[in-house]
Interface confidence: medium
């Protein structure tokens, strides 16, 4: 009876809920209900009733496997779906599926706390900005990874004379996406600029504005 | 070219704790993420703790988390290994050293000894 | 974790010859991101290639790097007398930074 599946998606997309074993043969009776008591479908007697809810015009079953469509999910759409089976025993079976339902995160922003030049080095205080989210960092120098256990919203660094790593990137993920912002330096410190805005790697995130401080301080968390 | 020197190393009893010192001099120290790197006598080389110029992210190597607490002093330009719960496998020479933007070691301290007996 | 084996354990050979040491890793380091370093007995390591094949600040040239994915080598062109110690690589392409277990590089 305890059969829950753990599925995360992405919101806006098509959602299939299914079981990963055959269905009863011959059963009376399939119900996919959101939540224990909310119906969503049942199918009987070689029919399918949907039923007023808010999936009404997004959701298609599949008799023969049991499958939910769902299209365009939401957050809101984030819960326990159970599919109950009643076999020609008169037995029922049920099966569970959470399905958590996350936004694409946004692009970061990279705020530049702090840019000096100090015994002949270039230390950079550097954070990653995105609103309210929960997710995970990953910064890279030149494309080479930090070290994982300093993969939180802020990188500080000190750049030596052989320690040539120009461009900046924070990478924020969950586990449906990853978007990247990236800043590069001029050496041997000082900000790359073109029109008020920090030119980055291509291939590492798109183009990342300059902005101050009091833009950013209601977004910023550590 | 910035400067190390550790100090606070000696003998220990098992389950009995130190606390080792790095002072830097000639660099400004808190703009460095450091490290702790240990040398078993006769053996090779292995890292054991990391922290970051501000003292805002630290990391321990999994044979002494919950054990040992690296910390800094920024204003004493002075680094910090609180080593508690010692037991013999950490006898060796422990060497302070700046992680070069948290990849290779450049320079090092020129280590102290900690000997964990009975 | 990523571990680095270096060969041979010891090397024997006479100041003027030429020392070549091998570093295998268990699995490819990324972008090459390799360091060697040379310990002399009472002193602290020193760092002489960095990304596999770049000299560090004040290294002769004597001393170079190559190598790349899982096969890395530092050769000593012409070895000084004070070119005889042990020497280390050590991998950060990843998390935890870890060392090899050294080869000694000894008089013959």
């Known amino acids: 009876q305890g059969h829950l599946v753990h599925m995360t998606v992405v919101s806006g997309s098509n959602v299939t809920l299914n079981i990963s074993e055959s269905l009863p043969e011959n059963y009376k009776q399939l119900t996919w209900f959101y939540t224990f008591d909310q119906k969503i479908v049942e199918w009987d007697s070689r029919k399918s009733k949907y039923f007023e809810s808010k999936f009404k015009g997004r959701v298609r079953l599949d008799p023969q496997s049991g499958a939910l469509y769902i299209s365009k999910v939401q957050k809101e759409d984030n819960s326990t779906y159970i599919m109950r089976v009643l076999k020609k025993t008169g037995n029922e079976q049920e099966w569970k599926i959470k399905l958590q339902v996350l936004d694409p995160v946004p692009k970061p922003v990279i705020k530049i706390e702090k840019i000096e030049d100090m015994d002949d080095n270039c230390y950079l205080k550097l954070s990653c900005v995105i609103p309210g989210e929960s997710v995970n960092y990953t910064w890279y120098g030149d494309k080479r990874p930090f070290p994982k256990e300093l993969q939180n919203s802020v990188l500080e660094t000190t750049l030596m004379p052989h320690n040539y790593s120009r461009c900046y990137t924070c990478q924020v993920s969950n586990s449906v996406s990853s978007k990247n912002g990236t800043v590069c330096l001029s050496p041997p410190c000082t900000l790359a600029r073109s029109e008020q805005k920090l030119i980055s790697e291509e291939d590492l995130g798109g183009e990342q504005k300059l902005i101050s401080e009091e833009d950013l301080h209601h977004h910023h968390h550590h | 070219e910035g400067q190390l020197l550790e100090s606070g190393g000696g003998l220990a009893q098992p389950g009995g704790s130190l606390r080792l010192s790095c002072a830097a001099s000639g660099i400004t120290f808190g703009r460095y993420a450091m490290s702790w790197v240990r040398q078993a006598p006769g053996k090779g080389l292995e890292w054991v703790s990391l922290?970051?110029?501000?003292?805002?992210?630290?990391y321990h190597a999994d044979s002494v988390k919950g054990r040992f607490t690296i910390s800094r002093d920024n204003s004493k330009n002075t680094l910090y290994l609180q080593m508690n719960s010692l037991r013999a496998e950490d006898t060796a020479v422990y060497y302070c050293a700046i992680y070069n933007n948290y990849n290779w070691f450049d320079p090092w301290g020129q280590g102290t000894l900690v000997t964990v007996s009975s | 974790e990523i571990v680095l084996t270096q060969s041979p354990g010891t090397l024997s050979l006479s100041p003027g010859e030429r020392a070549t040491l091998s570093c295998r890793a268990s699995q490819s380091v990324s972008s090459n991101y390799l360091a060697w370093y040379q310990q002399k007995p009472g002193q602290a390591p020193r760092l002489l290639i960095y990304?596999?094949?770049s000299r560090a600040t004040d290294i002769p040239d004597r001393f170079s790097g190559s190598g790349s994915g899982t096969d890395f080598t530092l050769t000593i062109s012409r070895l000084e007398p004070e070119d005889f110690a042990v020497y280390y690589c050590?991998?950060?392409?990843?998390?935890?930074?870890?060392f090899g277990q050294g080869t000694k590089v000894e008089i013959k």
């Open positions: 922290i970051s110029g501000s003292g805002g992210s630290t």
């Open positions: 990304d596999a094949s």
């Open positions: 050590q991998q950060y392409g990843s998390s935890p930074r870890t």
